[in-house]
Amino acid sequence: QRINTEKETLPKPIIWAKPSIMVTNGNSVNIWCQGAQSASEYQLYFEGSFFALERPKPSRSMNKVRFFISQMTSHTAGIYTCFYQSGELWSKSSNPLKLVVTGLYDTPNLWVYPRPEVTLGENVTFFCQLKTATSKFFLLKERGSNHIQNKYGNIQAEFPMGPVTRAHRGTYRCFGSYNDYAWSFPSEPVTLLITGGVENSSLAPTDPTSSLDYWEFDLSTNESGLQKDSAFWDHTTQN
């Protein structure tokens, strides 16, 4: 197990997950850790505890390893970090990777007010409701970009979009969370259509899909530890 020293001089590795940071309960996920060509050992930590290690074979000139989680559960959802060793030196910790398990307990309802087809500039609000009491809701847009908001609440959340632009058009789903890394089943998708403006933008986004596997997530982490372009709004309502 890695010993903490003050002389951790090796650059930190990069950590990411495939196919996604969001994994359906019972499904598998790969966690990749990329360090250095000279690395003799990689260690993966979960919630601060030693989780797994890999010693690359000398014959394989690789600067990354793959850790395989065969069945994602609420017990394997949370924050992962990795380290690598080269010679006598250990690297600094990677940025945190936040793995979420979905498909737990219940399915929320998602709807949009005033309606799914609106004109450019009209005010739109998404509502997500989950019968099982929860404290936080997440709204995700397929092929979305990074946008995170927070509120606290109970069985329903509001996601005010304000005056919509063409960038808001697309297909949305919501989740209720039982903790930050354990989420409900996804809601049924709701597609927001925008009409009006210079060009008719009423068409749904190209290649819409109901499969989470097609959602575009950038699975690396930025300096603050947040997922970059993770395509979710984090919303909790206040009652």
Epitope: R55, V65, R66, Q71
Partner: nanobody, 126 residues
Framework: EVQLVESGGGEVQPGGSLRLSCAAS????????MGWFRQAPGKGREFVAA???????YYAESVKGRFTISRDNAKNTLYLQMSSLRAEDTAVYYC????????????????????WGQGTLVTVKP
């Protein structure tokens, strides 16, 4: 579905030896990463040793140099050779598997394992 059955537990004096076995059903054993955990009376489950698909091993500091983990893929069996046993080694020993797995992964955390045996009791006393 993988089934794991441990055997070889029993009572032994301090300084003595035992060999635990874990028989796995199914044809997935060779593609599994395996581990041994133990739970002493009134304590939580703790990691003992683990082995990758390609026989790379890792041990808890408390057993390093005394215990040896090995596997026989032809017999679908995992072993834990225990020597220089101490009173603090008294526990129920569990065999666990990660199926499937990849490459040379060695799993240390119990949450990684998706199949568990029922356990076999090892008692070390004079």
């Amino acid at each position: 579905e993988v089934q794991l059955v441990e055997s070889g537990g029993g009572e032994v004096q301090p300084g003595g030896s035992l060999r635990l076995s874990c028989a796995a059903s199914g044809r997935t054993f060779a593609s599994a990463a395996m581990g041994w955990f133990r739970q002493a009376p009134g304590k939580g489950r703790e990691f003992v040793a683990a082995i990758s698909r390609s026989d790379d091993t890792y041990y808890a500091e408390s057993v390093k140099g005394r215990f040896t983990i090995s596997r026989d893929n032809a017999k679908n069996t995992l072993y834990l050779q225990m020597s220089s046993l101490r009173a603090e080694d008294t526990a129920v020993y569990y065999c666990a598997a990660v199926v499937p797995t990849y490459g040379n992964n060695i799993y240390v955390h119990s949450a990684a394992y998706n199949y568990w045996g029922q356990g076999t009791l090892v008692t070390v006393k004079p």
